[in-house]
Interface confidence: low
């Protein structure tokens, strides 16, 4: 078996750094090489070097090694910034703790346990001995530093300068004692570089022997330095990939700090009544998921087995069966007491009003100049100057650069839904910021709701009750499946995008969902030739309070005779009252022997004021809602059809003008349905489609 020993994991890397010797007597050796690994191997073996190598610099531009008999802690040396340089320092010479028996310890402690100064190894006074530096090459018997050249039980020791005491061990702590972490170590940035069984960790920037996704450049905030133990993925404690090809990864033995409190920077803001960001700090007592199913206790393994236990996730407050977000999901969740539903989001918990004092915006926030720099999901905003190319891609005027300072939330594109920012996360290129409109600000973002100013033309599940079966040209209609059962409707608005409602997603796991296209029968019977089944790759939640979701498909739908897209209306348009529209869905239809066929119910548009009267004044509609009433009493959408469309025709063009969402009644006589008004969110939809990456067909 041919395998070169790779020793680069024994070095601490400082990127873009070199060492400059102030003391001209210090030696340096240089040579042209291809990689930093080659420099490391030679430094570790001291091969062909006239000194003990303690550090090296790899010059990436010249492909050159500079080997040093000193490191950044040595006198006569200073650190200097340099783009093309990476400094690697042998950890043994900068570590102030020992691993195991301390055989590799090469630090500078030179005092014994009882405080006696050590005798130099090259001296025979006051004690004669055979531990000569020349006899123990590679054991670094330098000066009078504590060492353990034979790997004896007590750890590093030295001959003492006291003639009465021949030798004594030195009080150098174990690295596992020095290193400690809080909670489950997600914020741990210590220097532990071996696992609990003593295996040396693989460098995060290496892919041998184990290839992995945790590349330092891809996750700059995860602290993937050298080969130190980290917890980037919400495990119970820090871990690392190992250099043992037979053991991909292992946990590290890092004890919990005595004062187990998190740094201020790591603490999510604790809330009890509402969710801030992704709700990692939610500490309230809601204990059911969105649809009322009770949560399973975190300390119970029934009905669902899991490792999200209070012991594994300290500091995450996994008490009782309360909704929590211990793993950085998009919002609080829990395992459920229903054996058929493993997990669910507690999406009924409201979002906190994040505006503090003056941090609010007027109108659509285009003049907001506050200094918030975080998105509503808790992502840090990235600098505007790094994203100008992307910004120019979706606006057709020159943005006011004087407003786009740092990474503060801004609204350079006149977005109707407030300030936003780019994130630097390729999956979520941009998102809105958690800033509210200022209290009392009634500036409408769209005017003249009930008067047709802008034409809509250019253009999806609640159950449709008492509707008529349909087969004609409804290729944009999507059946969203949850664990292989129909749960919601949706509209295919682009080959890779489905518009639906946020209430359609009870589970955190996208693998639980599929989109069925091209079907007429809810079970797909007789639709085999035309049916397309697509996985879901991402959910993009609409602006605050919209109840909309854009669901990204894992691959684009193939448009054919059975699958087509439906148009979106113009932004801010209004459709004339009494315009005839339709809602579609597969939900329960009021018939005893329901045949599972897609139904349509015909409705007509009703102005918001009149709609409010029909609801006996109990409902005030705003600019983000649209109302439609039934021509036939008791015909309209209900709960199997949430996410489905209200489709209207204007100038011979069919468009999705509304989305069916829960909470507004179910085909009650004389009670028109209230839908999410797609025209109000059309710019947001276009912006997502334009800026989010989708798989190519």
């Amino acid at each position: 078996q041919r395998k070169r020993r790779n020793t680069i994991h024994e070095f601490k890397k400082s990127a873009k750094t070199t060492l400059i010797k102030i003391d001209p007597a210090l030696k340096i050796k240089t040579k042209k090489v291809n990689t930093a690994d080659q420099c490391a191997n030679r430094c570790t073996r001291n091969k062909g070097l006239p000194f003990t190598c303690k550090a090296f610099v790899f010059d990436k531009a010249r492909k050159q090694c500079l080997w040093f008999p000193f490191n950044s802690m040595s006198s006569g040396v200073k650190k200097e910034f340099g783009h093309e340089f990476d400094l690697y320092e042998n950890k043994d010479y900068i570590r102030n703790c020992i691993i195991g028996k301390g055989r590799s310890y090469k630090g500078t402690v030179s005092i014994t346990k009882s405080g006696i100064k050590c005798q130099p190894w090259s001296s025979m006074i006051p004690h004669e001995h055979s531990f000569l530096p020349s006899s123990y090459r590679g054991k670094d018997l330098q000066e009078n530093y504590c060492r353990n050249p034979r790997g004896e039980e007590g750890g590093p020791w030295c001959f003492t300068s006291n003639p009465e005491v021949r030798y004594e061990v030195c009080d150098i702590p174990q690295c596992s004692e020095v290193e400690c972490m809080t909670c489950n170590g997600e914020s741990y940035r210590g220097l532990m570089d071996h696992t609990e069984s003593g295996k040396i960790c693989q460098r995060w920037d290496h892919q041998t022997p184990h290839r992995h996704k945790f590349l330092p450049e891809r996750y700059p905030d995860k602290g993937f330095d050298d080969n130190y133990c980290r917890n980037p993925d919400g495990q119970p404690r820090p871990w690392c990939y190992t250099l043992d090809p037979h053991t991909r990864w292992e946990y590290c033995a890092i004890k919990t700090c005595a004062d187990n409190t998190m740094n201020d920077t790591d603490v999510p803001l604790e809330t009890t009544e509402c969710i801030q960001g992704q709700g990692e700090g939610y500490r309230g007592t809601v204990n059911t998921i969105w649809n009322g199913i009770p949560c399973q206790r975190w300390d119970s393994q029934y009905p669902h087995e899991h490792d999200m236990t209070p012991e594994n996730f300290k500091c995450k407050d996994l008490r009782e069966n309360y909704c929590r977000n211990p793993d950085g999901s998009e919002s609080p969740w829990c395992f459920t007491t229903d054996p058929n539903i493993r997990v669910g989001y507690c999406s009924q918990i409201p979002n906190c009003d994040m505006s503090h004092g003056q941090d609010c915006y007027r109108g659509n926030g285009k003049n907001y100049m506050g200094n918030l720099s975080q998105t509503r999901s808790g992502l840090t905003c990235s600098m505007w100057d790094k994203n100008m190319e992307d910004l120019h891609r979706h606006i057709f005027w020159e943005p006011d650069a004087s407003k786009l300072n740092e990474n503060y939330c801004r609204n350079p594109d006149d977005d109707a839904h407030g300030p936003w920012c780019y994130t630097g996360n390729p999956l979520i290129p941009w998102d809105y910021c958690p800033i509210s409109r200022c209290e009392g600000d009634t500036t409408p973002t769209i005017v003249n709701l009930d008067h047709p100013v802008i034409s809509c033309a250019k253009t999806k599940q609640l159950r449709v009750v008492n509707g008529i079966p349909t087969r004609t040209n409804i290729g944009w209609m999507v059946s969203l499946r949850y664990r292989n059962k129909h749960i919601c409707g949706g509209s295919l608005i682009k080959e890779s995008w489905v518009l639906t409602a946020r209430q359609c997603f009870p589970s955190r796991d996208l693998k639980d969902y599929e989109a069925w296209l091209g079907i007429h029968d809810v079970h797909g019977r007789g639709d085999e030739k035309c049916k397309q089944v697509l996985n879901v790759s991402q959910l993009v939640y609409g602006p605050e309070g919209s109840d909309l979701v854009l669901m990204k498909l894992a691959r684009p739908a193939v448009l054919d005779d059975f699958v087509s897209t439906i148009d979106l209306p113009n932004y801010g348009c209004t459709i004339p009252e009494k315009t005839s529209c339709s809602v579609y869905g597969w939900g329960y239809t009021g018939l005893i022997n329901y045949d599972g066929l897609l139904r349509v119910a015909h409705l007509y548009i009703m102005g918001n004021e009149k709609c409010s009267q029909h609801h006996r004044g109990k409902v005030t509609l705003n600019e983000s809602e649209i109302c439609a009433g039934a021509e036939k009493i008791g015909s309209g959408p209900c709960e199997g059809d949430y996410g489905g469309p209200l489709v209207c025709e204007q100038h011979k063009m069919r468009m999705v003008l509304g989305v069916i969402v829960p909470g507004r009644g179910c085909a009650i006589p004389n009670r028109p349905g209230i839908f999410v008004r797609v025209a109000y969110y059309a710019k947001w939809i276009h912006k997502i489609i334009l800026t989010y990456k989708v798989p190519q067909s």
């Epitope: 078996q1 041919r2 395998k3 070169r4 892919q207 041998t208 022997p209 184990h210 290839r211 992995h212 996704k213 590349l215 891809r218 043992d244 090809p245 037979h246 053991t247 991909r248 990864w249 693998k511």
Partner: antibody
Framework: QVQLVESGGGLVKPGGSLRLSCAAS????????MSWIRQAPGKGLEWVSY????????YYADSVKGRFTISRDNAKNSLYLQMNSLRAEDTAVYYC???????????????WGQGTLVTVSS | DIQMTQSPSSVSASVGDRVTITCRAS??????LAWYQQKPGKAPNLLIY???SLQSGVPSRFGGSGSGTDFTLTISSLQPEDFATYYC?????????FGQGTKVEIK
């Protein structure tokens, strides 16, 4: 498109030697880690050996260690398996497989050759 | 070495049926598991990687789940071309090991 074509299989007596080749095309061979995997008649799959893209890292299954040698020639887009001291239990179809880097996620065999049959019998 | 045990060793099913195959690892392998399909006289074909990610070009009726030691391959609606032998493979560490295979036959 990606293609892997094995050759060099045949009938050999116990204790004999054989050299298998795998010709790669349709992708940048020198960027990929490669493996040999075998399947005895009517049996399951057994991973045999692995070589990194540069050839500097090599691993073998215990059952072949010391007898088989994996190598590659990136200039010729070829992977090799030198098999010495062959035994009856080495009889199998030998596949060469590309180990897809998959954007840095982990090891998996995304393309396989059609296989070459090695029969060890007296 | 990590042992991979598949069950059942064979299953008889009809077109349209939902088929589930399980794979158990002798020790925890996180999500480092792949599923392959092999038809007689042909090379294996990668279906699922990292326990649940669908390899491009594979029909969405194939799905994978699980982590740790227990994994499942599900074919939601069996098609005529799905009759084959299925193997799981762990990629947690060398030596990479496969399950003994599960043959899906026509009932």
């Amino acid at each position: 498109q990606v293609q892997l074509v094995e050759s060099g299989g045949g009938l050999v007596k116990p204790g004999g030697s054989l050299r298998l080749s795998c010709a790669a095309s349709g992708f940048t061979f020198s960027d990929y880690y490669m493996s040999w995997i075998r399947q005895a008649p009517g049996k399951g799959l057994e991973w045999v050996s692995y070589i990194s893209s540069s050839g500097s890292t090599i691993y073998y299954a215990d059952s072949v260690k010391g007898r088989f040698t994996i190598s590659r020639d990136n200039a010729k887009n070829s992977l090799y398996l030198q098999m010495n001291s062959l035994r009856a239990e080495d009889t199998a179809v030998y596949y060469c497989a590309r180990d897809e880097y998959n954007s840095g996620w982990y090891v998996l065999f995304d393309y396989w050759g059609q296989g070459t049959l090695v029969t060890v019998s007296s | 070495d990590i042992q991979m045990t598949q069950s059942p060793s064979s299953v008889s099913a009809s077109v349209g049926d939902r088929v589930t195959i399980t794979c158990r690892a002798s020790q925890g392998i996180s999500s480092w598991l792949a599923w392959y399909q092999q038809k007689p006289g042909k090379a294996p074909n990668l279906l699922i990687y990292e326990a649940s990610s669908l390899q491009s070009g594979v029909p969405s009726r194939f799905g994978g789940s699980g982590s740790g030691t227990d994994f499942t391959l599900t074919i939601s609606s069996l098609q005529p071309e799905d009759f084959a032998t299925y193997y799981c493979q762990q990629a947690n560490g060398f030596p990479w090991t496969f399950g003994q295979g599960t043959k899906v036959e026509i009932k």
